[in-house]
């Protein structure tokens, strides 16, 4: 008996071939001997089976001695043994229909679990193997689970169902809902405008939800909500914003926030959360602001940074085109009695400059100028 595997919702062609290469009488029946379809001369005739409106054949192939049964929009319950009667012979084909579906939704939040469930006909004992877009293989029986979904799990999952040494392949598109970056750092000189961007790592036609940016300033004892907003069909509207700082928010995606001025009291880290409609859980992106200030008070030239800096960052003060006068893994450096000229304060990581602030030191009888 020939075995054919089909996919739920798909179309399958069961073949039946006669030795004579011409149109002759044929019938397809199910295991209960109920006629599905056949021919009467050149006409296609249908029986009283439950497949009636989903069964078809191809007249053009009958002249070649081929009498296919084509079943559209397959259902698990179409799994059966189908019998083709032609030339006083009977050809049997066992059709097994499988379905593979994602638990609740194919759009899942980062960190959530994906469960794939296999629907199979009674009496079958299939095995399933799935390959994620990043090449990770998982195996299972009726259900397969992947916990802690990551951004790289977004894309097409290819699952192979094996039964009777035959296989059928399913492709399921999974979208992991997340921000492109889990965390970002913005480095700014005091007084500069700050731009925070929160690009999403997915695109959907309609995006609705609400969000909030909580901020923990380095100098503050507790965190504070800086802004709350709504998202409706990719349009952003601000609900509430603090007076200090007075953030501005872009009206379109990607989510975009502007802080008019980088000030030491704002340096710190924030957490933007986005709750999407009909989703449990929230998307998170951490954002950090590091602010630099270079000042000269009397005979002391000082450079300071505020905000979350890594211990390996180097803060230096140097006269332009000269070697660094002072260079420390600290958040403040200074030079006493600095020479006149353009001084640079540099925050660097392994030689790469992250932030730079220039201050002009005038001869001692003048006051300093900050460009």
């Amino acid at each position: 008996k020939k075995v054919v595997l089909g996919k739920k919702g798909d179309t399958v062609e069961l073949t039946c071939t006669a030795s004579q290469k011409k149109s002759i009488q044929f019938h397809w029946k199910n295991s209960n001997q109920i006629k599905i379809l056949g021919n009467q001369g050149s006409f296609l005739t249908k029986g009283p089976s439950k497949l009636n409106d989903r069964a078809d054949s191809r007249r053009s192939l009958w002249d070649q001695g081929n009498f296919p049964l084509i079943i559209k929009n397959l259902k698990i319950e179409d799994s059966d043994t189908y019998i083709c009667e032609v030339e006083d012979q009977k050809e049997e084909v066992q059709l097994l229909v499988f379905g593979l579906t994602a638990n609740s939704d194919t759009h899942l939040l980062q960190g959530q679990s994906l469960t794939l469930t296999l629907e199979s006909p009674p009496g079958s004992s299939p095995s399933v193997q799935c390959r994620s877009p990043r090449g990770k293989n998982i195996q299972g029986g009726k259900t397969l689970s992947v916990s802690q979904l990551e951004l790289q799990d977004s894309g097409t999952w290819t699952c192979t169902v094996l039964q009777n040494q035959k296989k059928v392949e399913f492709k399921i598109d999974i979208v992991v809902l997340a921000f492109q970056k889990a965390s970002s750092i913005v480095y700014k000189k005091e007084g500069e405008q700050v731009e925070f961007s929160f690009p999403l790592a997915f695109t959907v036609e309609k995006l609705t939800g609400s969000g909030e940016l909580w901020w923990q300033a380095e100098r503050a004892s507790s965190s504070k909500s800086w802004i709350t907003f709504d998202l409706k069909n990719k349009e952003v509207s601000v609900k509430r914003v603090t007076q200090d700082p007075k953030l501005q928010m872009g009206k379109k995606l990607p989510l975009h926030l502007t802080l008019p001025q980088a000030l030491p009291q704002y340096a710190g880290s924030g957490n933007l959360t986005l709750a999407l409609e009909a989703k449990t859980g929230k998307l998170h992106q951490e954002v950090n602001l590091v602010v630099m200030r270079a000042t000269q008070l009397q005979k002391n030239l000082t450079c300071e940074v505020w905000g979350p800096t890594s211990p390996k960052l180097m803060l230096s003060l140097k006269l332009e085109n000269k070697e660094a006068k002072v260079s420390k893994r600290e958040k403040a450096v200074w030079v006493l009695n600095p020479e006149a000229g353009m001084w640079q304060c540099l925050l660097s990581d392994s030689g790469q400059v992250l932030l730079e602030s220039n201050i002009k030191v005038l001869p001692t009888w003048s006051t300093p100028v900050q460009p």
């Epitope: 089909g6 179309t11 050149s42 006409f43 191809r58």
Partner: antibody
Framework: QVQLQQWGAGLLKPSETLSLTCAVY????????WSWIRQPPGKGLEWIGE???????NYNPSLKSRVTISVDTSENQFSLTLISVTAADTAVYYC?????????WGQGTLVTVSS | DIQMTQSPSSVSASVGDRVTITCRAS??????LAWYQQKPGKAPKLLIF???SLQSGVPSRFSGSGSGTDFTLTISSLQPDDFATYYC?????????FGQGTNLGIK
């Protein structure tokens, strides 16, 4: 909803080879037959040939010696190759799904053969 | 090959008219016939299959009849959207063949 998206070179010189590909999105690939049909400017429709997911083909005898239709089931795509083209092969080429009837159709690709 | 002949080759009519297009096969094709509508610059669209079955989404003013060698497409009350070229096609045997088309224009 099944959609057919087709692409390929639109301008050829006589004796060159025409190559078109059609991708099937959003529906079953197996169980159906996948056809190519052409329509010369201002004229009627001509069936070129068909293929199914397992690679079984049928061709129009008038073109059989020059035509090859192939299938790539992993990508849900099928392709048309027509060798030794002449000006008479200038037409809009359509990819189409069928069992017995042609539906749906691709958007069509105008192929012009000119020296 | 089975030849499909449509008549008339072109016809002019007004909105609200009843229009009939015929298609004749050079040999018996039972009911293995379809009708298509094509508008300029667009792909054809399936209207009727198996001689008389209306394709899903097609307005009920379109109907098909016939069997064997003679077939008819009828538009009961012509609408502005119906001005187009109509083709019949046989699916009885290879190679599949189409009629030469009937151009339905505005009177």
């Amino acid at each position: 909803q099944v959609q057919l998206q087709q692409w390929g070179a639109g301008l050829l010189k006589p004796s060159e080879t025409l190559s078109l590909t059609c991708a099937v999105y959003g529906g079953s690939f197996s169980g159906y037959y996948w056809s190519w049909i052409r329509q010369p400017p201002g004229k009627g429709l001509e069936w070129i040939g068909e293929i199914n997911h397992s690679g079984s083909t049928n061709y129009n005898p008038s073109l059989k010696s020059r035509v090859t239709i192939s299938v790539d089931t992993s990508e849900n795509q099928f392709s048309l190759t027509l060798i030794s083209v002449t000006a008479a092969d200038t037409a809009v080429y359509y990819c189409v799904r069928l069992i017995n009837w042609f539906d749906p159709w691709g958007q069509g690709t105008l192929v012009t053969v000119s020296s | 090959d089975i030849q499909m002949t449509q008549s008339p080759s072109s016809v002019s009519a007004s909105v609200g008219d009843r229009v009939t297009i015929t298609c004749r096969a050079s040999q018996d094709i039972s009911n293995w016939l379809a009708w298509y509508q094509q508008k300029p610059g667009k792909a054809p669209k399936l209207l009727i299959f198996a001689a008389s079955s209306l394709q899903s989404g097609v307005p009920s003013r379109f109907s098909g009849s016939g069997s064997g060698t003679d077939f008819t497409l009828t538009i009961s009350s012509l609408q502005p959207d119906d001005f187009a070229t109509y083709y019949c096609q046989q699916a009885n045997s290879f190679p599949y063949t189409f009629g030469q088309g009937t151009n339905l224009g505005i009177k």
